[in-house]
């Protein structure tokens, strides 16, 4: 996981400035108010593999 | 590097009382919901109290099998988490861990502490 | 309560075999999006070591022999190669709800 300056976040993460490393997007649905959020509704989710 | 260090556990008496710490350190630890989980023979793993963060006020959780009996809290200046079990049964003997989640899995886990409740 | 049920209780493997783990919810745990259970390694005299996330997605430093599946109700765990190392027992975690609930464990040793 490295800062946005360097490479993006991996699919289905987005940068997090207050925790200063990428997060899930999918803890958005427990905690939608989290930083890193506004980056992961611009951004596809990880698809499933079933 | 992440560690999470627990304190408290020992022998106590059916309808006793216990307090354990758990001391965090390499994470930004006001950010991070604070459980408790333990673990039994007979139980399995199981999770039992929750705390979350100061900007909501610090909303707590519960399992059914401890509400009214455990209450956890935490300081966040000091990197802590406890949970104050009173009224204590024998089926609470078990191993207790404290464990990080940001919303969902458990990435980060304690070295657990025993609870032994008999007389 | 969200109940997990996995199959088998436990499970004896070849070296260089595969283990196959079940995890099944009482109800389903996914979104159009993500899927809330999550795999943990638990070894003797030792708290549970957290393996993978939504369902597929490994932590970092979890080799990629370890692997994840499934939406729904229905989860798998699939450890192949498996090692020696591997000999432990794994559990599945919902987060879908409060309260967040294990299953009761799968044993895996090895031949």
């Known amino acids: 996981e490295q800062a946005p300056g360097n490479a993006p976040c991996s699919r289905g993460s987005s940068w997090s400035a207050d925790l200063d490393k990428c997060m899930d997007c999918a803890s958005c649905r427990a905690r939608p108010h989290s930083d890193f959020c506004l980056g992961c509704a611009a951004a596809p989710p990880a698809p499933f593999r079933l | 590097e992440v560690k999470l260090q627990q304190s408290g556990g020992g022998l106590v008496q059916p309808g006793g009382s216990m307090k354990l710490s758990c001391v965090a350190s390499?994470?930004?630890?006001?950010?991070?919901?604070m459980n408790w989980v333990r673990q039994s023979p007979e139980q399995g793993l199981e999770w039992i109290a929750e705390?979350?963060?100061?900007?909501?006020?610090?909303?707590?959780h519960y399992a059914e099998s401890v509400k009214g009996r455990f209450t956890i809290s935490r300081d966040d200046s000091k990197n802590s988490v406890y949970l104050q079990m009173n009224n204590l049964r024998p089926e609470d003997t078990g191993i207790y861990y404290c464990a990080c989640r940001y919303a969902d899995y458990f990435d980060h886990w304690g070295q657990g502490t025993t609870l032994t409740v008999s007389s | 309560d969200t109940v997990l049920t996995q199959s088998p209780a436990s499970l004896v493997v070849s070296l260089g075999q595969r283990a196959t783990i079940s995890c099944r919810a009482s109800?389903?745990?996914?979104?159009?999006?993500?899927?809330?259970i999550h795999w943990y390694q638990q070894k003797p005299g030792q708290p549970p070591k957290f393996l993978i996330k939504y369902a597929s997605n490994r932590d970092s430093g979890v080799p990629a022999r370890f692997s994840g599946s499934g939406s729904g109700t229905d989860f798998t765990l699939n450890i192949h190669p498996v090692e020696e190392d591997d000999t432990a027992i794994y559990y599945c975690q919902h987060s879908w709800e409060i309260p967040p609930t294990f299953g009761a464990g799968t044993k895996l040793e090895l031949q």
């Open positions: 390499g994470f930004t630890f006001s950010y991070y919901w």
């Open positions: 705390i979350r963060l100061q900007s909501n006020d610090y909303p707590t």
């Open positions: 109800q389903s745990v996914s979104t159009s999006d993500y899927s809330y």
